[in-house]
Interface confidence: low
C-alpha cells in the first residue's frame, strides 16, 4: 500500500436546503483507471461511512442509488455534494481516495471538510 | 461495435460445476462492470453479482455467495461465471452484461442441469 | 433485499393503444431502470434513472415515478412492442428485478 495525497477544503457552510458540496482532490501518480472514493464522518471520536463509490476513469461517478452523495470526477478530482443534511449532521467529512487499479494500489486520506450545518428557522406562518 | 459474446450451451449433472465465459470487444475492457444475471425457463431475471474487470472488485448477491464466483482475464477480454453444487433448479439462461445500465448484453447461455 | 412487484402481468393490448405497465417497490428507491425482452433475446434496455430514454429507444417510451411507484407507458404500440417488460432496482444489493410484465397483442 502507498500514501497518496488528498486534498479537500478546511470548511464548508450547507445551504439552507441542507447540501453541502466540495472538492476532493488527490494526487495520482500514475494514470488510474479505477478509483473508490469514500466519505467518513468524524464527530465525538467516532468515525462512520457516509458514502462511497467505486468508479471507472472517464465513466459517471455512480454511488448506490439511494445514497445522500452524489458526485462527478474529472481527472483527478471528484467533486461530491451530500444531500438531506441537518444541524445534527454538523462534522468532520473526510475524503479517502484508493487506486484500485492498475497497480499498485494507493491510499490517501484528506485532512477532513468541517461541514456546519444549520437548520433554518421555520416560516412564521408556515405550519410545517 | 461493442459485443459480448459467451460460450455455448452446457448439459451438467446434479453437484458439478459449470464456468461461463463471456468475452468482450469494442470497449475498453477494464472500463466497465461486468454484472452476470440468470433467467430460469419461463421466469424473470435473477442478478447473480458483478465484477469491476481492472481490479477484480466484486459483488455478490447473497443468494450465490459461496456457489457462485466471477473472474476475468484481463488479457482476452473474458470474464468468467462459474456456479459450483449444480442443482436442477439452476437450469436457465445465463447471461453477462456491462455495467452501464446494461447497455450491453451477452446472447445467453444455456446451462441445463439434469441428471 | 428490494422486491419489486409488477402488476399486470399481463397485459393485452392492440398496436395503436396505449399501454401503461407498473412496478412497486417493497422500499422507498431513488430511481427505476425498464428493460424489454422479446422471446428468444437477451434484454434490452429501455429506461434509466426512472425517466431516461435509452439510447435508440423511439420517444413512444416514457418512464415516471417516485418512491415506491414506478410506471412504464408506450403511448401507441407498434407490433414490435409486444414483448415482456422488466424493471429494475440498483438502489441497494442485490440488484433486483420485477417479475416481468407481458404484453401481448388482442
Known amino acids: 500500500c502507498k500514501a497518496m495525497h488528498v486534498a479537500q477544503p478546511a470548511v464548508v457552510l450547507a445551504s439552507s436546503r441542507g447540501i453541502a458540496s466540495f472538492v476532493c482532490e488527490y494526487a495520482s501518480p500514475g494514470k488510474a483507471t479505477e478509483v473508490r472514493v469514500t466519505v467518513l464522518r468524524q464527530a465525538d471520536s467516532q468515525v462512520t461511512e457516509v458514502c462511497a463509490a467505486t468508479y471507472m476513469m472517464g465513466n459517471e461517478l455512480t454511488f448506490l442509488d439511494d445514497s445522500i452523495c452524489t458526485g462527478t470526477s474529472s481527472g483527478n478530482q471528484v467533486n461530491l455534494t451530500i444531500q438531506g443534511l441537518r444541524a445534527m449532521d454538523t462534522g468532520l467529512y473526510i475524503c479517502k481516495v484508493e487506486l484500485m487499479y492498475p497497480p499498485p494500489y494507493y491510499l490517501g486520506i484528506g485532512n477532513g471538510t468541517q461541514i456546519y450545518v444549520i437548520d433554518p428557522e421555520p416560516c412564521p406562518d408556515s405550519d410545517f | 461495435q461493442v459485443q459480448l459474446v459467451q460460450s455455448g450451451a452446457e448439459l451438467k449433472k446434479p453437484g458439478a460445476s459449470v464456468k461461463v465465459s463471456c468475452k468482450a470487444s469494442g470497449y475498453t475492457f477494464t472500463s466497465y462492470w461486468i454484472n452476470w444475471i440468470r433467467q430460469a425457463p419461463g421466469q424473470g431475471l435473477e442478478w447473480i453479482g458483478r465484477i469491476a474487470p481492472g481490479s477484480g472488485t466484486t459483488y455478490y448477491n447473497e443468494v450465490f455467495k459461496g456457489r457462485a464466483t466471477i473472474t476475468v482475464d484481463k488479457s482476452t477480454s473474458t470474464a468468467y461465471m462459474e456456479l459450483s453444487s449444480l442443482r436442477s433448479e439452476d437450469t436457465a439462461v445465463y447471461f453477462c452484461a456491462r455495467g452501464d445500465y446494461g447497455s450491453y448484453w451477452g446472447q445467453g447461455t444455456l446451462v441445463t442441469v439434469s441428471s | 433485499e428490494i422486491v419489486l412487484t409488477q402488476s399486470p402481468a399481463t397485459l393485452s393490448l392492440s398496436p395503436g393503444e396505449r399501454a401503461t405497465m407498473s412496478c412497486s417497490a417493497s422500499?422507498?428507491?431513488?430511481?427505476m431502470h425498464w428493460f424489454q425482452q422479446r422471446p428468444g433475446q437477451s434484454p434490452r434496455r429501455l429506461i434509466y434513472?426512472?425517466?431516461k430514454l435509452a439510447s435508440g429507444v423511439p420517444a413512444r417510451f416514457s418512464g415516471s415515478g417516485s418512491g415506491t411507484d414506478y410506471t412504464l407507458t408506450i403511448s401507441s404500440l407498434e407490433p414490435e412492442d409486444f414483448a415482456t417488460y422488466y424493471c429494475?432496482?440498483?438502489?441497494?444489493?442485490?440488484?433486483?428485478f420485477g417479475q416481468g410484465t407481458k404484453l401481448e397483442i388482442k
Open positions: 434513472d426512472t425517466s
Open positions: 429494475h432496482q440498483r438502489t441497494s444489493y442485490p440488484l433486483t
Open positions: 422500499s422507498s428507491i431513488s430511481y
